[in-house]
């Protein structure tokens, strides 16, 4: 996470306490998981399988879509982010069972753990721009008909890519294997040395804009949204709507355990008896904040559920109707009937 | 008490190979990792590898690529260490040192009295 | 590799006083287990070295209580209350914490 932050399993009793019966043979590898790294890897291989399975189902679903359809560039892009950041879960997986013994190298050590951070970036500024999206669907229906078109969500979702890709960088940077003396390990994560200071502007630029800011604008956001939406019932995309907020409170609570953390690690002394609770619960957080890459396909099939009444379609279908349909503004007050039906046309050509 | 005795001192031609012994008395011989540290004349100390005789079990500094090879005989406590392909610059002091695994201490401890290898032509 | 950084690298004292040695390390010694590793060692002349301080600030034992040993992470002080002649020798600071062990490039004490 922030420090160098993976703890040894149970060496305890090989320090900091008297000697034991010297004829005792040591035993240099410890048997026994914690059990918040018992929970970590539970929830590190649901979301493997669910995310792997769903993510790619969304990919393969949404990409037909995504030449036409606005939302499903949108969805497309969420997928992508959570399906490769599933990808480096194997890898995760084993380093926890191995007591966080790193055997596959630096290059591997900068690049997979970053995968989550660029996930959560990638995540969250694409949410970002969908909720703008959705903003601007609701309150400026006139602009959306004339500008609103794939070629700009393209841009949109590049934009996001590359400054996810940005922010990623300082942990990418930073992130090294120590292998320690005894016990005997090589260790991945985040090392700042002699720079506290750094440390905890990552941290701090890592919960502004990765979580406090997005949380800030996007509940403004949808206070606006909903609140137009059930005053004047002024919107017929109100799937996409509750899907889009149910996407965006789950990214909340799921990175919540994860900045908390983060944040307190960076303030706190690596030897503090705090930190090294902290520590312990660090795959846990990690893994908690994983759940994210799995949870959208869920929210999908429930939403898809909810609006079919029950499971009649195959899921591929039921993943379409949620995942591929266009928003159209009806503002009767605003707009003549032909206004709406000729303004329907050209949204669904989109 | 603990004591790390080592074999005496050696003069040996570049290219050949040195093996250094240090015997162990006073301790549970197994419990223990045997470091191997040396000092050229006038540097500092550099620590060249390590052995757990419980299981053979070894770590090497990169440094020396492969020249080092450290070995231990559980029945006679007895640790040792081989230097290959020697070198001038590998005239030194050569230490055994002992870390021992279940003390409060883990630090390296106790350290033999040191045997001095020259190499010369 | 960790490199650790003595200084300074000589050190006259007057019997009596008091005698300071810093111990810089490149990297942080905070092992993932909370503990630092970081220990001191004397070399007296012609002998091998000897442990003082292990883990930043622990005597080992016979150590007389005037040798201290004090800081965190990458920054470490050896201190000698009052400085008597068998303290005469090189003093090495170590670390442990991470492979391969390093050592500091000693620092000389000499009696003035």
């Known amino acids: 996470m922030n420090s160098f932050n993976y703890t040894t399993p149970d060496y305890g009793h090989y320090d900091d306490k008297d000697t034991l019966d010297l004829n005792t043979p040591v035993d240099k590898t410890s048997n026994t998981l914690r059990v918040p790294d018992i929970l970590a890897l539970v929830i590190f291989a649901v979301v493997f399988l669910v995310g792997v399975l769903g993510n790619a189902l969304v990919v393969w679903v949404t990409a037909f879509e995504a030449k036409r359809t606005i939302n499903a560039i949108w969805f497309l892009n969420l997928a992508v982010a959570d399906f490769l950041s599933c990808l480096a879960l194997p890898i995760l997986f084993t380093s926890i069972v191995q007591h966080h013994h790193w055997p596959f190298g630096g290059a591997a050590c900068s690049i997979l753990p970053s995968l989550i951070l660029l996930n959560m970036y990638a995540s969250i500024l694409l949410l970002a721009t969908i909720s703008a999206d959705r903003f601007l669907l609701v309150f400026k229906p006139i602009w959306c008909q004339n500008f609103r078109g794939a070629g700009l969500a393209w841009i949109a979702c590049a934009v996001a890519w590359g400054l996810a890709l940005l922010l990623t960088i300082p942990s990418f940077l930073y992130r090294v294997v120590r292998e320690e003396y005894f016990p005997p390990k090589v260790l991945c994560g985040v090392d700042y040395s002699h720079d506290k200071r750094r440390e905890r502007a990552v941290a701090i630029v890592r919960l502004v804009l990765g979580f406090l800011w997005p949380l800030l604008t996007l509940t403004i956001c949808y206070t606006f949204i909903l609140l137009r939406t059930w005053s004047r019932r002024a919107t017929r995309s109100t799937k996409t709507l509750k899907v889009v907020v149910a996407v965006v409170a789950s990214f909340f609570i799921f990175w919540l355990p994860y900045q908390v953390t983060g944040i307190m690690m960076s303030f706190l002394e690596p030897s503090s008896p705090t930190f090294l609770l902290l520590n312990k619960l660090d795959s846990l957080c990690v893994s908690f904040a994983y759940i994210n890459c799995c949870i959208n396909p869920i929210i999908y099939v429930v939403a898809g559920q909810g609006f079919q009444g029950r499971l009649r379609k195959s899921l591929p279908s039921l993943l379409r109707n949620v995942l591929t349909e266009e928003s159209v503004v009806r503002e009767s007050k605003s707009f003549t009937r032909s206004t709406v039906d000729t303004m329907a046309q050209k949204t669904q050509a989109v | 008490q603990v004591q790390l005795v080592q074999s005496g001192a050696e003069v040996k031609k570049p290219g050949a190979s040195v093996k250094i012994s240090c015997k162990a008395s006073?301790?549970?011989?197994?419990?223990?990792?045997m470091n191997w540290v040396r000092q050229a004349p006038g540097k500092g100390l550099e620590w060249m590898g390590r052995?757990?005789?419980?299981?053979?079990?070894?770590k090497y500094n990169g440094k020396f690529k492969g020249r080092v090879t450290i070995t231990a005989d559980e029945s006679t406590s007895t640790a040792y260490m081989e230097l290959s392909s020697l070198r001038s610059e590998d005239s030194a002091v050569y230490f055994c040192a002992r870390f021992l695994l279940i003390s409060t201490v883990t630090a390296v401890d106790y350290w033999g009295q040191g045997t001095t290898v020259t190499v010369s032509s | 590799d960790v490199v650790m950084t003595q200084s300074p690298l000589s050190l006259p004292v007057t019997l009596g006083e008091p005698a300071s040695i810093s111990c810089r390390s490149s990297?942080?010694?905070?092992?993932?287990?909370?503990?630092?590793?970081l220990h001191w060692y004397l070399q007296k002349p012609g002998q091998s070295p000897q442990l003082l301080i292990y883990k930043v600030s622990n005597r080992f034992s016979g150590v007389p209580d005037r040798f201290s040993g004090s800081g965190s992470g990458t920054d470490f002080t050896l201190k000698i209350s009052r400085v008597e002649a068998e303290d005469v020798g090189v003093y090495f600071c170590?670390?442990?914490?991470?492979?391969?062990?390093?050592f500091g490039q000693g620092t000389k004490l000499e009696i003035k």
């Open positions: 170590s670390q442990s914490t991470l492979v391969p062990l390093t």
């Open positions: 052995i757990y005789p419980g299981d053979g079990d070894t």
């Open positions: 990297q942080s010694l905070v092992h993932s287990n909370g503990n630092t590793y």
């Open positions: 006073g301790y549970a011989f197994s419990n223990s990792w």
